[in-house]
């Protein structure tokens, strides 16, 4: 006769492991007992369980409640056992020793591999600001057995570096993603992808990038100076900028206080019907937590009466 078993049995942490051991014997042969033992190198064989044809299933106190025979129907030549709720410490070599009548004893070894799926964690790096050099955007760590694979999925251009720490029964892998921050990266996803044989599918953790920046400020509304004349209604200046975090706007007048009737509405400065009093230098001050910018414009409100007088003077001068 001969023993049929597996070289390697692989289970995920917490699953039940079936340790196979089947005696393929000649007709008339009987199995008296099947003894299962841990057979790791450097330690004496530690009995796990013993299936006896007459006395039944015996279980080592160290494995009490965790070793069972497979559910019926059972073949009397089948010495397989179930190891319930596999833990990392169960990983190792096991020996099945079958005592038969009249052929004698047979033994076989198998290796139990317990996969420990990783629980990845993603840690964002320091605040990203435009103008920085190569900066850590995020690091992703996953520990498992065997060592997991940690990669990045993103449209953002960057560099990755990985390091691994081996523990007694597992390994921790940390991957870092570095980039040169730019405003175009704002809102872009950076996804850590963890692969492992104990996972049905890759685990993914996504971090949304936030890059602090503040664009140059500019003022719109003075494109046509001829519209800025005495009596015009609805005249306004609009301050243009963008930033992360979104900036706040403040309007001042360089050569004095804002004239009465001028309304500040965020990025917009609204004027009442224009008078020459509204002429002056206006400053838009844009700021966020990252930076601040200024843009100034000169408003020159034309008085048609003065203009016509000047024109007459010019004509008469010629």
């Amino acid at each position: 006769g001969e023993l049929e078993t597996s070289d390697v049995v692989t289970v995920v942490l917490g699953q039940d492991a079936k340790l196979p051991c089947f005696y393929r014997g000649d007709s008339g042969e009987q199995v008296g007992q099947v003894a299962w033992a841990r057979a790791d190198a450097g330690e004496g064989a530690q009995e796990l369980a013993l299936l006896h044809s007459k006395y039944g299933l015996h279980v080592s106190p160290a494995y009490e409640g965790r070793v069972e025979q497979p559910p019926p129907p059972r073949n009397p030549l089948d010495g397989s056992v179930l190891l319930r709720n596999a833990v990392q410490a169960d990983e190792g070599e096991y020996e099945c020793r079958v005592s038969t009548f009249p052929a004698g004893s047979f033994q076989a070894r198998l290796r139990l591999r317990v996969l420990v799926p990783p629980l990845p964690s993603l840690n964002p790096g320091p605040a990203l600001e435009e103008g920085q050099g190569l900066t850590l955007a995020a690091s992703c760590t996953a520990e498992g057995s065997p060592a997991p694979s940690v990669t990045w999925d993103t449209e953002v251009k960057g560099t990755t570096s990985s390091r691994s720490f081996k523990h007694s029964r597992s390994a921790a892998v940390t991957s870092e993603f570095h980039l040169v921050p730019s405003r175009s990266m704002n809102g872009q996803p950076l996804t850590c992808v963890v692969s492992h044989p104990g996972l049905l599918q890759d685990q993914r953790i996504t971090h949304i990038l936030h890059v602090s920046f503040l664009a140059e400020a500019s003022v719109r509304g003075l494109e046509d100076q001829n519209l800025w004349h005495v009596g015009r209604e609805g005249a306004m200046l609009k301050c243009l900028s963008e930033g992360q975090p979104p900036p706040s706007y403040n309007w001042t007048r360089l050569d004095g206080p804002l004239p009465s009737g001028v309304r500040v509405d965020g990025d917009t400065l609204g004027f009442p019907p224009l008078t020459t009093e509204h002429s002056g230098i206006y400053v838009c001050h844009v700021s966020n937590e990252f930076s601040s910018r200024d843009s100034q414009v000169t408003v020159d409100v034309l008085d048609p009466q003065e203009d016509s007088g000047k024109q007459v003077d010019l004509v008469s001068a010629s």
Partner: nanobody, 122 residues
Framework: QVQLVESGGGLVQPGGSLRLSCAAS????????MGWYRQAPGKQRELVAT???????NYADSVKGRFTISRDNAKNTVYLQMNSLKPEDTAVYYC????????????????WGQGTQVTVSS
């Protein structure tokens, strides 16, 4: 030929304790499983508890948590500590064992002792 000699039986009140011993002799080979069966009047012989030379245990559901089996391999002796005894534990308790043969093969023969009476009654 293996001889099994039991001792420790007797009369005990419900809730009491007894300790049975069984010594195996006459064997030049390794004793494999040792343990205890019992037979109440008019009933079939049933397993109580057995223990392997490697220390693995097998208990009948009816005695789990009350009875403890232990073994001294060097002395080829098995013990059964019986606590919280009940009237239904009344029976003749038989020691049992098997052994490996001269080539290290398991012998198909099961050996039995003469039995020791345990009576639980008030």
């Amino acid at each position: 030929q293996v001889q099994l000699v039991e001792s420790g039986g007797g009369l005990v009140q419900p809730g009491g304790s007894l300790r049975l011993s069984c010594a195996a002799s006459g064997s030049d080979f390794t004793i494999n499983v040792m343990g205890w069966y019992r037979q109440a009047p008019g009933k079939q012989r049933e397993l109580v508890a057995t223990v392997t030379s490697g220390g693995s245990l097998n208990y009948a559901d009816s005695v789990k948590g009350r009875f403890t089996i232990s073994r001294d391999n060097a002395k080829n002796t098995v013990y059964l500590q019986m606590n919280s005894l009940k009237p239904e534990d009344t029976a003749v308790y038989y020691c049992t064992a098997d052994q490996f043969g001269p080539l290290g093969h398991l012998s198909p023969i099961i050996y039995w002792g003469q039995g020791t009476q345990v009576t639980v009654s008030s």
